[in-house]
């Protein structure tokens, strides 16, 4: 699997999408886990509803929420109030029994540009008001890290 980068602004929300083959993964619950180290285990953060038919219902663990469009084949994870410590490697998983298939490897980057956190009224630089969005979901443009490319793991 290539790693897909999703970038979100610190303090705002970030939406991560994981597409999959809906037929191949029919009847399977999904999960979002955080990779602990390069070779370490993937620690479960949140998983979809225990009843697969109710996978469309949003389930939450702290600031992380998950919902699954089982017909369209898209798993969506929302990270609210993104913080620097949220930066790192994650996986979208499809569960079957005690096994888990990786749907997508994800690198979450937390953007920390200080101009994103200035009140528009206090701002001293012109033409920057577009940076001061409310904490709406950031539909990040993701990019894939090519095979062999070493990703930059952000530090917090």
């Amino acid at each position: 699997h290539n790693t897909t980068v999703f970038q979100g602004v610190e303090g705002q929300s970030l939406q991560v999408s994981c597409p999959y083959d809906s037929m191949k993964h029919w009847g399977r619950r999904k999960a979002w886990c955080r990779q602990l180290g390069e070779k370490g285990p993937c620690q479960r953060v949140v998983s979809t509803h225990n009843l697969w038919l109710l996978s469309f219902l949003r389930r939450r663990n702290g600031s992380t929420a998950i919902t699954d469009d089982t017909l369209g084949g898209t798993l969506t994870i929302t990270l609210r109030n993104l913080q620097p410590h949220d930066a790192g490697f994650y996986q979208c998983q499809s569960l079957h029994g005690s096994e888990a298939d990786t749907l997508r490897k994800v690198l979450v980057e937390v953007l920390a540009d200080p101009l994103d956190h200035r009140d528009a009224g206090d701002l001293w630089v012109p033409g920057e008001s577009e940076s001061f969005e409310d904490a709406h979901v950031e539909h990040s443009i993701s990019r894939s890290l090519l095979e062999g490319e070493i990703p930059f793991p952000p530090t917090s």
Epitope: V9, A87, L111, P114, D122, T155
Partner: antibody, heavy 115, light 112 residues
């Protein structure tokens, strides 16, 4: 007029502690995120620590080199930000600047760690 | 950490001539929002750093338009079109894309 005035820098021995204070005026302190940046003699600036506003629960972040030894805090009622530095090392020797890392910078205070 | 490499380490310029300073990043500083989190500072002797350029190419308040910033995702240039005596000092690039914020090693500008 915007002012940031750092105080508290001095000569200390390795392993000792020091508390830096940055008193500010002339800008809306309470909603500005503030940082400490240090600069060793003849070296480039190095980001040290960062504290957010009350609305962000005064969240703090640190450079790896100071994590566990330095603590950043702020007092909005006094428009001041602080840097508590424990277990000081010789490599902590630098001028310490209080800044919003954009337009507001203090003149710096010199911390010298030497035996 | 993001490493910023500046070149040259020092530059000597005759007043009225132009000067260019380069800054290369170990990774892309372009965000998915189309913002490039590369900043330029001037530190005059005995002073604290002073912001010149924000987000790669935007002139900070009060900075003369002799200064300009440009670049791509990883390679950046600060240009001073007609150097004046007051421009003497050390120029630093800095990235504020991700923590920890990092600065380049600096380029010292002197007058001939």
């Amino acid at each position: 007029e915007v002012q940031l005035v750092e105080t508290g820098g001095s000569l200390v021995q390795p392993g000792k502690s020091l508390r830096l204070t940055c008193a500010t005026s002339g800008f809306p302190f309470s909603n500005v995120w503030l940082h400490w940046v240090r600069q060793s003699p003849e070296k480039h600036p190095e980001w040290v620590a960062h504290i957010k506003a009350k609305s962000d629960n005064y969240a703090t972040y640190y450079a790896e080199s100071v994590k566990g030894r330095f603590t950043i805090s702020r007092d909005d009622s006094k428009s001041s930000v602080f840097l508590q530095m424990n277990s000081l090392k010789e490599e902590d020797t630098a001028i310490y600047y209080c800044t919003d890392i954009l337009e507001y910078w203090g003149q710096g205070t010199l911390v010298t760690v030497s035996s | 950490d993001v490493v910023l490499t500046q070149a040259p380490l020092s530059v000597s310029v005759t007043p009225g001539e132009s000067a260019s300073i380069s800054c290369r990043s170990s990774r892309s500083l372009l965000t998915s929002k189309g913002i490039t989190s590369l900043y330029w500072y001037l530190q005059k002797p005995g002073m604290s750093p002073h912001l010149l350029i924000y987000r790669m190419s935007n002139l900070a308040s009060g900075i003369p338009d002799r200064f300009s910033g440009s670049g791509s995702e990883t390679d950046f240039t600060l240009k001073i079109s007609e150097v004046e005596p007051e421009d003497v000092g050390v120029y630093y690039c800095a990235q504020f894309l991700v923590y920890p914020y990092t600065f380049g090693a600096g380029t010292k500008l002197e007058l001939k």
